[in-house]
């Protein structure tokens, strides 16, 4: 299926944005809670599936759009429902930090997509 023309954000750009919104922050989005996700089950779409429910929070909009662009690039991205921990809610900042840790690991090991 056709995807956006512009190249997706790189992993490095995503890391930079995640660092930008988490540094010196104790909380994000007024402490909003989101479902915890298993990032190994397609990290972009998994993280987006949880974070898309956060509204009225300009701080994470760029992250949401980056994840959307990266998730859109995946084959049948819209059809895969990622593994979600439906009994565990965590703060947005915690999910973003978890994502940052995971993405850094992926970047370090060169498995970019």
């Amino acid at each position: 299926s056709p995807s956006p023309v512009t190249p997706s954000p790189t992993l490095k750009e995503l890391i930079e944005e995640l660092v930008n919104i988490t540094q010196n922050q104790a909380s994000l989005c007024n402490g909003s809670m989101v479902w915890s996700v298993n990032l190994t089950a397609g990290m972009y779409c998994a993280a987006l599936e949880s974070l898309i429910n956060v509204s009225d929070c300009s701080a994470i909009q760029r992250t949401q759009r980056m994840l959307k662009a990266l998730c859109s690039q995946k084959p049948a991205a819209g059809q895969i429902s990622s593994e979600r921990s439906r009994d565990t809610k965590i703060e947005v900042i915690q999910l973003v930090k978890n994502l940052l840790t995971y993405v850094r690991g992926v970047y370090r090991h060169g498995n970019f997509r």
Partner: antibody
């Protein structure tokens, strides 16, 4: 109050280009992207793409590849959409919009700019 | 790209009747659907985001529901000022796509 004011109607020749402006006010221009959507007469809505004025990053709909250029001027809080190689199928009202509450849901819209392609 | 199929294309109802418009996505878009109202000669107006959240100032007679691939916009009691075209939008992934629209008229 968030406001988006677009440039006036344009009549252009087939094969030419058009540049539509969208002047914003009432919020910090670099906080939210500017989206562009068009609507052909009596038809539905079609998303063209967006620009993030914060870093100039753009995402375009594949249907407009190679023909559309989105730019933003931070000094005047104005966004621009340029569409080239115009044809009859491009006759439409072109809207700019922003999404503040929910990412990618455009809740503040310009008044629209009618672009007519005619020789 | 994700295709949104909206139905019906048009409907004509009496004042105070219940209006139901559906939007079916070609693939799972979770709850990332919004609804817009557009009156002739005007820009679209956002009513609902993330399937069921009403924007500030939108009358409570408008409600949205659904998730996955099937979504509904309901007007509980049709008022004359509700005569307009209604569009759904999926904002799960790019390119963002709209339904073809539903024209709501008064009998």
């Amino acid at each position: 109050e968030v406001q988006l004011v677009q440039s006036g109607a344009e009549v252009v020749k087939p094969g030419a280009s058009v540049k539509v402006s969208c002047k914003t006010s009432g919020y910090s221009f670099t906080d939210y992207p500017i989206y562009w959507v068009r609507q052909a007469p009596g038809a539905g809505l079609e998303w063209i793409g967006y620009i993030d004025p914060y870093n100039g990053g753009t995402t375009y709909n594949q249907n407009f590849k190679d023909r559309v250029t989105l730019t933003a001027d931070k000094s005047t809080s104005t966004a621009y959409m340029e569409l080239s190689s115009l044809r009859a199928g491009d006759i439409a009202v072109y809207y700019c919009a922003t999404a503040v509450v929910a990412t990618d849901v455009m809740e503040n819209w310009g008044q629209g700019t009618l672009v007519t392609v005619s020789s | 790209e994700i295709v949104l199929t909206q139905s019906p294309a048009s409907l004509s109802l009496s004042q105070e009747e219940r209006v139901t418009i559906t939007c079916k996505a070609s693939q799972n878009v979770r709850n990332a659907v919004a609804w817009f109202q557009q009156k002739p000669g005007q820009a679209p107006k956002a009513l609902i985001y993330l399937a069921s959240n009403r924007y500030t100032g939108v009358p409570s007679r408008f409600s949205g529901s659904g998730s996955g691939t099937d979504f509904t916009l309901t007007i509980s009691s049709l008022e004359p000022e509700d005569v307009a075209d209604y569009f759904c939008l999926q904002h799960w992934n790019y390119p963002l796509t709209f339904g073809a629209g539903t024209k709501v008229e008064l009998k």
